[in-house]
């Protein structure tokens, strides 16, 4: 058992069936020795009496607020929180697995540049009393400072049968230093508490590998006099690192034709110009990529040729 | 470039930028493979880092490329003399297109094009011998590689940098 | 729109057994544990019984252990409870509940969905 915060405790629990689970000591927070009395959550019924109350967790019936009283008036309470360990690995009830990049990826993180500012993202079905708190640092062993925002319910999406949710907040390294080489990694930590459960994910990485460039912006066409070419042309977006002769992009264009099936030529320009043939009801499409490390590729921008 | 004489930029530009493409096909991201473990943090201390204070941002460039330099070159020899180790040279072999030996040479190129014949910088210590398991040293070159990635990227961009604004 | 719908109640002698079923619809109740909770005239609503997720885990109040049995159908969206050697005690309106995230609690309080509920009554 360990303390999460001020009379909140998380009970770890080997999970399965009649497992012994752990025994607890529960100690009333007062100098009153004589008359106390125990309960747990709103029900009336006295669990026991005396300054302590010895108690065998073993499943969530014997979580939640425990309360000690004497003459009708509450002295003190302990919230105890199961968290869950099977087979040896600590469960993963709350949030979906997102299986990208690979198995067990619970948490997603993003960046549009390199100022140590990135998004972290998860999903859940569950609707009700669900509450998240996030810590961040780089490095574990000597950790230095991340401060993130408060988690926000970013979306909401029908999935078959269910409604799932998606929770998202925003972290920003407090001493970022965009030119150099990181050496150590960010590590994000996310405890979730649903109702009496607690559950904690963790992820780590580098920013270089989480950079996801805004599409670009201001995409043009030219047509071109006397011909079936048109110049296109489009600029690095506002949210991307600079100056841009030092954090450089380098874009793949691409022009679609009506049809899916069509077969559509890519080509790869450090440039921010090029010359293609745009035929009627195709579309020009750019993306843009980190010009020396090979992080993701934004979303596409595109316009259409006519 | 020692001395304080400017380096070639435009030339380092190119061979930067392609020590990245040679460096991202010898090691593209195979599926996401998280190459971190548990005292990791400890482990990449034996390599140069280019690090906040080495002058490598836009603004230190300005100021006094030479640190900054200097810094790359020691990273180019650490990395040229790992790849020519027996981590990359032991069991098991190479694929005979594999592209480190390029990768290598352009190490070598780009060290010599920061530091010509006659003058020595100080160079880091070369690494602790290599691990004894094929599979160990297997997993060492992809973490090399992973690192040598980083590295040549900010390599790349100090090198962009100067050639579009400190150029002659 | 959630619904749970409870059936199976009805009026029977000590001794007897009855078989209440619950029907879910509306959302898949596969990631929810269900419960089984009654209320006799008078008095707090009470858990009766409960089974996790996966069915694999179950828990019953002292008064029932041994007697009652939950069991569920993840394909179908249906939990039963099926009540052996009932005893007028017994007796009481039976609800049918669910709570999101897997695991029982017994706990009125904490389940997210609920029926309508079905009168059980035990005569002497």
């Known amino acids: 058992i360990w303390e999460l915060k001020k009379d909140v405790y998380v009970v770890e629990l080997d999970w399965y069936p009649d497992a012994p689970g752990e025994m607890v000591v529960l100690t009333c927070d007062t100098p009153e020795e004589d008359g106390i009395t125990w309960t747990l959550d709103q029900s009336g019924e006295v669990l026991g009496s005396g300054k302590t109350l010895t108690i065998q967790v073993k499943e969530f019936g014997d979580a939640g607020q425990y309360t000690c009283h004497k003459g009708g008036e509450a002295l003190s309470h302990s919230l105890l929180l199961l968290h869950k360990k099977e087979d040896g690995i600590w469960s993963t009830d709350v949030l979906k697995d997102q299986k990208e990049p690979k198995n067990k990826t619970f948490l997603r993180c993003e960046a549009k540049n390199y100022s140590g500012r990135f998004t972290c993202w998860w999903l859940t079905t569950i609707s009700t009393d669900l509450t998240f708190s996030v810590k961040s640092s780089r490095g574990s062993s000597n950790p230095q400072g991340v401060t993130c925002g408060a988690v926000t319910l970013s979306a909401e999406r029908v999935r078959g049968d269910n409604k799932e949710y998606e929770y998202s907040v925003e972290c920003q390294e407090d001493s970022a230093c965009p030119a150099a080489e990181e050496r150590l990694p960010i590590e994000v930590m996310v405890d979730a508490i649903h109702k009496l459960k607690y559950e904690n994910y963790t992820s780590s990485f580098f920013i270089r590998d989480i950079i996801k460039p805004d599409p670009p912006k201001n995409l043009q066409l030219k047509p071109l006099k006397n011909s079936r070419q048109v110049e296109v042309s489009w600029e690095y977006p506002d949210t991307w690192s600079t100056p841009h002769s030092y954090f450089s992009l380098t874009f793949c264009i691409q022009v679609q034709g009506k049809s899916k099936r069509e077969k559509k030529d890519r080509i790869f320009t450090d440039k921010t110009s090029a010359t293609v043939i745009c035929r009627k009801n195709a579309s020009f499409s750019v993306q843009a990529q980190d010009r020396y490390y090979s992080s993701s590729w934004s979303e596409w921008a595109s316009v259409p040729c006519s | 470039v020692p001395g304080g004489s400017s380096p070639a930029w435009a030339q380092c530009q190119q061979l930067s930028q392609k020590l990245c493409t040679l460096a991202w096909s010898a090691h593209p991201l195979v599926g996401h493979m998280d190459l971190r473990e548990e005292g990791d943090e400890e482990t990449t201390n034996d390599v140069p880092h280019i690090q906040c204070g080495d002058g490598c941002d836009p603004q230190g460039l300005r100021d006094n490329s030479q640190f900054c330099l200097q810094r790359i070159r020691q990273g180019l020899i650490f990395y040229e003399k790992l790849l020519g180790s027996d981590i990359f040279t032991g069991e098991p072999s190479l694929l005979p297109d594999s592209p480190v030996g390029q990768l290598h040479a352009s190490l070598l190129g780009l060290s010599q094009l920061l530091q010509p014949e006659g003058h020595h910088w100080e160079t880091q210590q070369i690494p602790s011998p290599s691990p004894s398991q094929p599979w160990q040293r297997l997993l060492l070159r992809f973490k090399i590689l992973r690192s040598l990635q980083a590295f040549v990227a900010v390599a790349a961009r100090v090198f962009a940098h100067g050639a579009a604004t400190l150029s002659p | 729109e959630v619904q749970l719908v409870e059936s199976g109640g009805g009026l029977v002698q000590a001794g007897d057994s009855l078989r209440l079923s619950c029907a879910a619809s509306?959302?898949?109740?596969?990631?929810?544990?269900m419960g089984w909770f009654r209320q006799a005239p008078g008095k707090e609503r009470s858990f009766v019984a409960a089974?996790?997720?996966?069915?694999?885990?179950?828990g019953y109040a002292g008064s029932v252990k041994g007697r009652f049995t939950i069991s569920r159908d993840g394909v179908e969206n249906m939990v039963f409870l099926q009540m052996n050697s009932l005893v007028p005690e017994d007796t009481g309106v039976y609800y049918c509940?669910?709570?999101?995230?897997?695991?029982?609690?017994?706990?009125?309080?904490?389940?997210?969905?609920w029926g309508q509920g079905t009168q059980v009554t035990v005569s002497s």
């Open positions: 509940a669910a709570v999101e995230g897997r695991d029982y609690y017994r706990g009125a309080q904490y389940y997210d969905y």
């Open positions: 509306g959302r898949s109740f596969s990631n929810d544990a």
């Open positions: 089974i996790n997720w996966s069915g694999e885990l179950t």
